[in-house]
Amino acid sequence: KRFHDVLGNERPSAYMREHNQLNGWSSDENDWNEKLYPVWKRGDMRWKNSWKGGRVQAVLTSDSPALVGSNITFVVNLVFPRCQKEDANGNIVYEKNCRNEAGLSADPYVYNWTAWSEDSDGENGTGQSHHNVFPDGKPFPHHPGWRRWNFVYVFHTLGQYFQKLGRCSVRVSVNTANVTLGPQLMEVTVYRRHGRAYVPIAQVKDVYVVTDQIPVFVTMSQKNDRNSSDETFLKDLPITFDVLIHDPSHFLNYSTINYKWSFGDNTGLFVSINHTVNHTYVLNGTFSLNLTVKAAAPGPCPPPPPPPPRPPKPTPSLGPAGDNPLGLSEIPDENCQINRYGHFQATITIVEGILEVNIIQTTDVLMLVPGPDSSLIDFVVTCQGSIPTEVCTIISDPTCEITQNAVCSPVDVDEMCLLTVRRAFNGSGTYCVNLTLGDDTSLALTSTLISVPDRDPASSLRMAN
């Protein structure tokens, strides 16, 4: 059998393999050692017994989408049946005091690979033996502690494969410079040690995307905006636009990035090198926001010019390019810059909102029949912008962290936006008061610290804004 027979549904085309050469990966035309690595079809009954105590699930994730030329990283995590975990030696053990369907296990080990490898024979002086090899026959790399790595992962994409020895989690990074744009499929098959051979325990696949567009996300936030995710914002208050470029491999780290904004309100184009920008809309309505991100990124470099002719030497002549259709020469150090672009577009709605709220006066309400340890205080509040429909007060400790009391109530305010909010305080002391005025789209906050005196006629109320 060949790798593509084992790993894929269909043999990849020569076109696909030629157009997507991955550095350090091998052609899936290579032979697969089925004696050492048995191949089971989906639905084969042997899968049921491939792992003690249930099935192992492999979870494959990637940091896709990847800008062409950058690295994309794939991570495989093995999820063991309940109560099982990998220990520091790479053995699979039962978690202490964990009950599964079989109850508590007397044997601490699910798989004690250390014990097996210590009494393993048939090895030469290098610790290498005929079974410490990958499915294509390549020997395992002898990193320190390689014996604690008991899983073999075979990654397969674009007609090529990559083999890795690992523990219950592995990561593989692939450079996408030679990958065709668009969605691609990554498939991973996982084997575990089993005596002098290996047993398949899981298969998983995931789609990843290689793109020529810089992946761009924009977060929009605004003080007093009630719902930041509905793309409705308030007039006359700055909106903060923060651009996040999805670049997990830091491909654009050394690039100068330009942000070109059009806010759709006839204020023209705004070009910035800062990923954060503020903009204030002064009219109500619906506006089309457009952002173009431009970055000079490393791109494909032309091959170096041929060296000048030398005096003839008895060396074999090289045929024209194409004689070896799968030959790849070394990539030189040139830094060939090309412009990459990313785009973001959003439609945002601008409405009236409460822009500002201020407490202009606080008054101790003298009660004819004072309650025990209870004070009533009036807060005289003004606001700017639209008319609020509700008022909320949160009374908390002086650090403004421990809430003692929260009250919200509807409110009817005149055009002048002047209202009095009366609240009760239990006992004397210093309080933090958060006062919020709200309507459908906005929520404006002000805070103050007040000192409530003892119930002594001579004492007065103090407010520190």
Epitope: S13, A14, E18, H19, L181, D212, P300, P303, S329, I331
Partner: antibody
């Protein structure tokens, strides 16, 4: 809109050389392999060859590779086909085509090359 | 080299008909087959990829199918604008090869 425009064709005498150009626009030229295909009058299409993004891999149809050379200039968004020792059997319309996930997803309008004395 | 055989070289059809254009590969090419439409005096247009998938912007009356080494392009309810040459092409192996084409003509 993807656009490929060939130029450089015309009448050429047998045994002579000719260089065709293909100007690309509407896509990131440097992100794609590019290819050449020809079509003799009244005949089917024939693949000539292809070049990868950075010009390091060039594949030809075997019987043409000694006389035809494909190159590209990413800075100019241009693909080239250098043809030498032309014969009457090379009379054809020459098309440049973009190669994406599959070959030849977009084609130029073609340029006629007539080899005659 | 892999031969792609298109026979017949021309087909006479009526508007509104369902037409099936065949193509046979000389060896296994899996599903790696493209179909192209070429109107008189024009350059080819990509219609079908991977034997059965419609390329961008291609009307849904076009479809592709595969049975072993036999591939076909079907046009349901033929329209006058569909009169053209149709070429199949394999990309399983190098060199990439085309069929000789099938010309659709109106009766």
């Amino acid at each position: 809109e993807v656009k490929l425009v060939e130029s450089g064709g015309g009448l050429v005498q047998p045994g002579r050389s000719l260089k065709l150009s293909c100007a690309a626009s509407g896509f990131n030229f440097y992100d794609y392999w590019m290819g050449w295909v020809r079509q003799a009058p009244g005949k089917g299409l024939e693949w000539i060859g292809e070049i990868n993004k950075d010009s390091r891999t060039i594949n030809y149809t075997p019987f043409l590779k000694d006389r035809f050379t494909i190159s590209r200039d990413n800075a100019q968004n241009t693909l080239y086909l250098q043809m030498s020792k032309l014969g009457s059997e090379d009379t054809a319309i020459y098309y440049c085509a973009r190669e994406g996930r599959v070959p030849f997803d977009y084609w130029g309008q073609g340029v006629m090359v007539t080899v005659s004395s | 080299d892999i031969q792609m055989t298109q026979s017949p070289s021309s087909m006479s059809v009526s508007l509104g008909d369902t037409v099936t254009i065949p193509c046979r590969a000389s060896q296994d090419v899996g599903s790696y087959v493209n179909w192209f439409q070429q109107k008189p005096g024009k350059s080819p247009r990509h219609m079908i990829y991977r034997a059965t998938n419609l390329a961008d912007g291609v009307p849904s009356r076009f479809s592709g199918s595969r049975s072993g080494a036999d591939y076909s392009l079907t046009i349901s309810s033929l329209e006058s604008e569909d009169v053209a040459d149709y070429h199949c092409q394999q990309y399983a192996e190098y060199p990439l090869t085309f069929g000789s084409g099938t010309k659709l003509e109106i009766k």
